[in-house]
């Protein structure tokens, strides 16, 4: 069970801590485009020339809201857009083109790394300053999706990162005999 999502004032959802969202629709023309954020794209399926492939990272800036509060400053979020395919075949609004073989695997540009950012909130009525940490996408990568797999079973074709799925971080058990190992009942 992860942290709840953090809504911005455009009614879109910024993920809370522990949440890893699906990429949003690919046709948002209000976003400021930046492909790969200056990084070379990951190698999808049988690539001859790395520069032929494109994984788009879109940046946009929003004020975030939490209850009646609003972030003191806007937050810039990165969104991973569309499929990974040869750059020459990808129009500005990325189309779902089967570019290698009809029954071959599908590649998608999805979040790779995340970062948590502390956001100062401005709230009505209360004198106390309040803050929230929001989890934002830090980079994108290409992952393979075959038609036999659910979208949650994406295959990683970039260098493996240690970030576990859904914010779960494998850890050694608590240290020492004093630690109570009983699992918490924090979820309904």
């Amino acid at each position: 069970q992860g942290w709840q999502a953090f809504r911005n004032d455009a009614t879109e959802v910024i993920p809370g801590l522990g949440e890893y969202p699906e990429p949003p629709p690919e046709n948002n023309q209000t976003m400021n485009r930046a492909e790969n954020g200056g990084r070379p794209p990951h190698h999808p399926y049988d690539a001859k020339d790395v520069s032929e492939y494109s994984c788009r990272e879109l940046h946009y800036t929003r004020f975030l809201t939490d209850g009646p509060c609003r972030s003191a400053k806007p937050v810039t979020e990165l969104v991973c857009s569309g499929q990974c395919g040869p750059a020459r075949l990808l129009p500005n609004a990325i189309g779902r083109v089967k570019w290698w073989r009809p029954n071959g695997p599908d590649f998608r540009c999805i979040p790779d790394r995340y970062r948590a950012q502390r956001v100062q909130l401005l709230c009505p009525g209360g004198a106390a300053p309040r803050s929230r940490k929001v989890r934002l996408v830090a980079s994108c990568k290409c992952k393979r999706l075959t038609r036999f797999h659910n979208q949650s079973e994406l295959k990683d074709f970039g260098p493996e990162t240690a970030r576990p799925q859904k914010g779960r971080k494998p850890r050694p058990g608590a240290r020492g005999a004093k630690a109570n190992q009983a699992e918490l009942e924090n979820a309904y």
Epitope: G16, L17, G126, A127, A128, R130, S131, V134, K169, L184
Partner: antibody
Framework: QVQLVQSGAEVKKPGASVKVSCKVS????????QHWVRQAPGKGLEWMGW????????EYASKFQGRVTMTEDTSTDTAYMELSSLRSEDTAVYYC???????????WGQGTTVTVSS | DIQMTQSPSSLSASVGDRVTITCKAS??????VAWYQQKPGKAPKLLIY???TRWTGVPSRFSGSGSGTDFTLTISSLQPEDFATYYC?????????FGGGTKVEIK
């Protein structure tokens, strides 16, 4: 799943200090705020303070100011709460809690009983 | 400090009953109120925050309302697992403070 596992029960003499640990798993501690709340036997909940493990920022309830210190070891994802100059009225169950805000307590540890007795 | 006064301090109810718990703040706290459930020997669990927003996984029978100084937690149809003590908490001004609790017992 986010889990918080606290250290075991402590018995202390008046005037001594106690340091309670809270091991966080399921998420990097630096991406959260850590809170401490206590509950005296048969009584209600009392907020002690919060800390931001990433930058070491803290906010303590004025009642505990000067007696409480909240720290974290981000390499082990463990939070610590040290309370000094203990008196009998500090006898309570001490809970660590974590969350993405400075104001609500999303996930809780199982509690650590601290008994102050001469 | 802002005082949070809960009432009643305890109540007896039956499974299926509609239960209402109130919390009164000593000064205006806008909607900066959370509700927690605690069972004997266990840690509290977050139910509601911002007066009316349900936390992840909390059943829809739990609802919160109110603003300013008067707040309400309602359990629309009490279930066996709902017998517990409920606390309100304000986070409008430091120090964050809790109400004294309302114990919901089986009639």
């Amino acid at each position: 799943q986010v889990q918080l596992v606290q250290s075991g029960a402590e018995v202390k003499k008046p005037g001594a200090s106690v340091k309670v640990s809270c091991k966080v798993s399921g998420f990097p501690i630096k991406d959260t705020f850590q809170h401490w709340v206590r509950q005296a036997p048969g009584k209600g909940l009392e907020w002690m303070g919060w800390s931001d493990p990433e930058i070491g920022d803290t906010e303590y309830a004025s009642k505990f100011q000067g007696r409480v210190t909240m720290t974290e070891d981000t390499s082990t994802d463990t939070a610590y709460m040290e309370l000094s100059s203990l008196r009998s009225e500090d006898t309570a169950v001490y809970y660590c809690a974590t969350g993405d805000t400075t104001y609500k307590f999303d996930f809780w540890g199982q509690g650590t009983t601290v008994t102050v007795s001469s | 400090d802002i005082q949070m006064t809960q009432s009643p301090s305890s109540l007896s109810a039956s499974v299926g009953d509609r239960v209402t718990i109130t919390c009164k703040a000593s000064q205006d706290v806008h909607t900066a109120v959370a509700w927690y459930q605690q069972k004997p020997g266990k840690a509290p669990k977050l139910l509601i925050y911002w007066a009316s927003t349900r936390w992840t996984g909390v059943p829809s029978r739990f609802s919160g309302s109110g603003s300013g100084t008067d707040f309400t937690l309602t359990i629309s149809s009490l279930q066996p697992e709902d017998f517990a003590t409920y606390y309100c908490q304000q986070y409008s001004d430091y120090p964050w403070t809790f109400g004294g609790g309302t114990k919901v017992e089986i009639k």
